[in-house]
């Protein structure tokens, strides 16, 4: 061994200086008699070594590194040997920090595993091997006087928790507990906890269950849930308080908390919930009034609240068959009266014959928003209800009366955009109570069953914007009927488009007669198409061989046109443009040649 390094300290605070000396023995005869000692930290050469020959002939180099900023590095003492650097000796240097005081020490008593589990936060990284030890002792009082020491609890590497087994615990008696952290640069201790393991007991939660419905018990009200829980038996004798949390399964609602509940409640009716809604519920408990820790939340229980009877207003409208006036088509729309108006399962139309107390004849039961039935001859009125499993809405009477009220006037319609139509009118005198507006495809696609309708509750309204089921390029029939106290007025109707289509093609041009300076053209007009506006005019265009263009505007009833002032023996390109308010379309181009001056006219 030719060289040997010694250091002031192999482990230092990060950033602190470190001094090292390297001694080369004299008997390394193969070396240069005056060798130059070099220092290297990691891969970098370090300047600043002070070299001297000692009295015994050995060479010594001393270096001071002002700041050791590597948490781990090798310091080497080297010589130049030929072209390479020869390492004579090296030492490992480490730098870091003494352990910070462990903080947030807390413990939980687990009655099932019969152990006290303590955990802590170790603090910032020390960059050095640091050991943690959970230390404790038994104490009769408030930990001022130390009783028997308990065996140290050493966590597995890298863990910040440790379990003290039951054999080292005394329940209902205080223990002093702290964490000691130790590394090469120092030792630190957490503040001491003084606790009775039972005061940090963490229980298991009860198991939530749905209550078995008993025949004599009343079913839960709408928006209520009946549930019960099975206490965790090993904690049965511990007085506890519990809390329940619940939230609807759908949507983004946060948990709502209910409590405190005594563990012994065992069964509970939870109200104030949304009807007909699936809820997730959980329960947790804590030792109380004595100290303890909250249990985890129990596994979820999923329950559905009962629904409430529909709370809706039913707007109704009806129509009689022209061929059979006793066959009635009844339409309705549910209008919620509350934010949560209850689910609607179906609708029933019924009639109560006069003089037959209690006898109600159902005329139809449907999930649709209309039904057709035969009205008994003596029936002037039927009742409509919406229903679900919880009951029915308030009955809506529907009275079948003649049209005896005044009619509205000046019914008109205009397009707002391709998907809406505005229908306006002048209200009759006296004001109606409201209006029914119906709309659907006009002829030839008209159908009574496919009409959309709306009730306008304001009798002073002078118009209504139709936004449902309106498509461009379709002709709509709009029917408006005023409604009065016990009757209605006659229905008025109007036709309208929300958007019309330009002509799809212009008629083909045909040459009928031609001369030297004229040409007679004709065409067959396109038949009118529904959804397309009527033609407003034609424009005929012709262009000569010199690319000069000419045009003439013709009215929409034109069937032909004579071009005059043409050049003899000349080529012309001609096309027809058919125009409506919605746009214009060109025909195909007709090319012709006028006759030569010596030729005879063609007819």
């Amino acid at each position: 061994e030719c060289g040997h390094i010694s250091v002031s300290a192999p482990i230092v605070h990060l950033g602190d200086p470190i001094t090292a000396s390297c001694i080369i023995k004299q008997n390394c005869s193969h070396l240069d008699p005056e060798p130059q000692i070099l220092w290297r930290l990691g891969a970098e050469l370090q300047p600043g070594g002070r070299q001297q020959r000692l009295s015994d002939g050995t060479q010594e180099s001393i270096i001071t590194l002002p700041h050791l900023n590597h948490t781990q590095a090798f310091l080497s003492c080297c010589l130049n040997w030929g072209n390479s650097l020869q390492i004579l000796d090296q030492v490992e240097l480490r730098a870091g920090y003494p352990p910070a005081i462990p903080h947030n020490l807390s413990c939980l008593m687990n009655l099932t595993t019969s152990s006290l589990i303590c955990q802590w936060e170790p603090g910032p990284e020390t960059h050095l091997p640091t050991s943690f030890t959970l230390k404790s002792f038994k104490s009769r009082g408030n930990c001022q006087t130390q009783g028997d020491s308990i065996l140290d609890c050493v966590p597995k590497d890298g863990q910040s928790h440790c379990c003290i087994p039951r054999k080292h615990l005394l329940l209902y008696q205080n223990m002093g507990i702290w964490v000691q952290a130790e590394n090469a640069l120092g030792t630190s201790m957490s503040p001491q906890l003084c606790l009775d393991p039972m005061d940090v007991v963490k229980l298991e939660p009860p198991m939530l269950r749905t209550m078995d419905p008993s025949p004599e018990a009343a079913p839960p009200q709408a928006g209520c849930l009946q549930l019960c829980w099975e206490p965790w038996q090993p904690g049965l004798h511990i007085n506890q308080k519990c809390e329940l949390r619940h939230k609807p399964q759908r949507g983004e609602a946060s948990w709502a908390l209910v409590g405190p509940l005594p563990l012994e409640a065992l069964q509970y009716e939870l109200c104030g919930l949304l009807p007909a809604t699936a809820y997730t519920l959980q329960i947790r408990c804590i030792r109380w009034p004595l100290p303890g820790h909250w249990s985890d939340w129990s596994p979820s229980l999923e329950l559905r609240t009962t629904e409430r009877a529909p709370t809706v207003r039913l707007d109704t409208w009806w129509r009689q068959r022209q061929l059979d006036p006793r066959t009635v088509q009844l339409f309705w729309k549910p209008v919620p009266l509350e934010e949560d108006s209850g689910r609607i399962q179906g609708y029933v139309v019924s009639w109560r014959p006069s003089g037959q107390a209690g006898a109600i004849l159902p005329l139809c039961n449907t999930t649709e928003l209309s039904c057709t039935f035969h009205l008994p001859s003596e029936a002037q009125e039927v009742a409509l209800v919406a229903y679900n499993s919880a009951g029915t809405s308030r009955p809506t009477p529907v009275v079948f009366s003649e049209s005896r009220g005044p009619a509205l006037t000046r019914l008109h319609a205009m397009a707002r955009d391709p998907h809406s139509l505005w229908v306006g009118w002048e209200p009759p005198n006296p004001w109606p109570q409201g209006y029914v507006i119906e709309w659907g495809l006009g002829p030839p696609s008209a159908s009574n069953s496919n009409k959309t309708w709306r009730m306008e509750q304001n009798g002073r309204a002078t118009g209504f914007l139709l936004k449902e089921n309106i498509r461009p390029f379709q002709l709509y029939e709009i029917i408006v009927t005023p409604l009065y106290q016990d009757t209605m007025g006659p229905s008025q109707h109007v036709y309208a488009y929300s958007q019309e289509m330009a002509p799809s093609h212009a008629p083909e041009l045909h040459l009928k007669h031609i001369g030297k300076t004229w040409a007679q053209l004709e065409w067959v007009p396109e038949p009118p198409e529904l959804g397309k506006s009527p033609l407003t005019h034609y424009t005929i265009f012709w262009t000569n061989a010199q690319n000069q263009s000419f045009s003439a505007i013709l009215n929409a009833s034109s069937r032909g046109f004579v071009l005059h002032g043409l050049e003899p023996a000349s080529l012309y390109h001609i096309h027809l443009m058919a125009a409506s308010q919605a746009g214009a379309t060109n025909s195909t181009v007709l090319t012709l040649m006028t006759l030569t001056p010596e030729g005879s006219e063609l007819h």
């Epitope: 054999k167 329940l171 038996q233 090993p234 005594p262 012994e264 030792r287």
Partner: antibody, heavy 118, light 107 residues
Framework: EVQLLESGGGLVQPGGSLRLSCAAS????????MGWVRQAPGKGLEWVSS????????PYADSVKGRFTISRDNSKNTLYLQMNSLRAEDTAVYYC???????????WGQGTLVTVSS | DIQMTQSPSSLSASVGDRVTITCRAS??????LNWYQQKPGKAPKLLIY???NLQNGVPSRFSGSGSGTDFTLTISSLQPEDFATYYC?????????FGGGTKVEIK
């Protein structure tokens, strides 16, 4: 000092009824589970029933279920055991006991003898 | 229901002897095992709770150990006042049950 004093024992015919009482003092009665344990002559101990601190939970041994009813009156610091349809095998010393949080019987009364015989 | 089996049912020992009584549960009961001492004509008295915790006022010669299904009550040096019947009791699950008892007699 905790004291539990049973009363109400005695001789009763099979099929008859008896009500045992246990007067408690020296601790906050309403915070503790209470229970009854019996011991037939020359035999071991048998748990009969317990009752939670506010009376909401009342487990029973299978041998007495449906016949015995445990109850308590926290305002009177008193525990009760109503025994109906008594049988000869119910003959025993009945002890009233205060329970601890881990289900141990912390304190016991001196016991009251119930004899079921014709 | 959990069955508690105590052994031996009786034993004879002398003052100063070390005495061990065992109790076995038919299924795991963690540490929910309590030991009682009963002298003739008297009410039982709690000695050990939760398997190994000495009840206040009980001499330290009494100790308990075990967990799960097998438990032991040890009297390190038997004293004249220790001659009595000893019972174990599980309190983890309802119904709570006692062992059949072990009678410790003077040899």
């Amino acid at each position: 000092e905790v004291q539990l004093l049973e009363s109400g024992g005695g001789l009763v015919q099979p099929g008859g009824s008896l009500r045992l009482s246990c007067a408690a003092s020296g601790f906050t009665f309403s915070l503790y589970w209470m229970g009854w344990v019996r011991q037939a002559p020359g035999k071991g101990l048998e748990w009969v029933s317990s009752i939670s601190s506010s009376g909401g939970v009342t487990p029973y041994a299978d041998s007495v279920k449906g016949r015995f009813t445990i109850s308590r009156d926290n305002s009177k610091n008193t525990l009760y055991l109503q025994m109906n349809s008594l049988r000869a095998e119910d003959t025993a010393v009945y002890y009233c006991a205060k329970l601890g949080e881990l289900g141990m019987f912390l304190e016991w009364g001196q016991g009251t003898l119930v004899t079921v015989s014709s | 229901d959990i069955q508690m089996t105590q052994s031996p049912s009786s034993l004879s020992a002398s003052v100063g002897d070390r005495v061990t009584i065992t109790c076995r549960a038919s299924q795991g009961i963690s540490s929910y095992l309590n030991w009682y001492q009963q002298k003739p004509g008297k009410a039982p008295k709690l000695l050990i709770y939760y398997a190994s915790n000495l009840q206040n006022g009980v001499p330290s010669r009494f100790s308990g150990s075990g967990s799960g299904t097998d438990f032991t009550l040890t009297i390190s040096s038997l004293q004249p006042e220790d001659f009595a019947t000893y019972y174990c009791q599980q309190s983890m699950w309802m119904p709570m049950g006692f062992g059949g008892g072990t009678k410790v007699e003077i040899k």
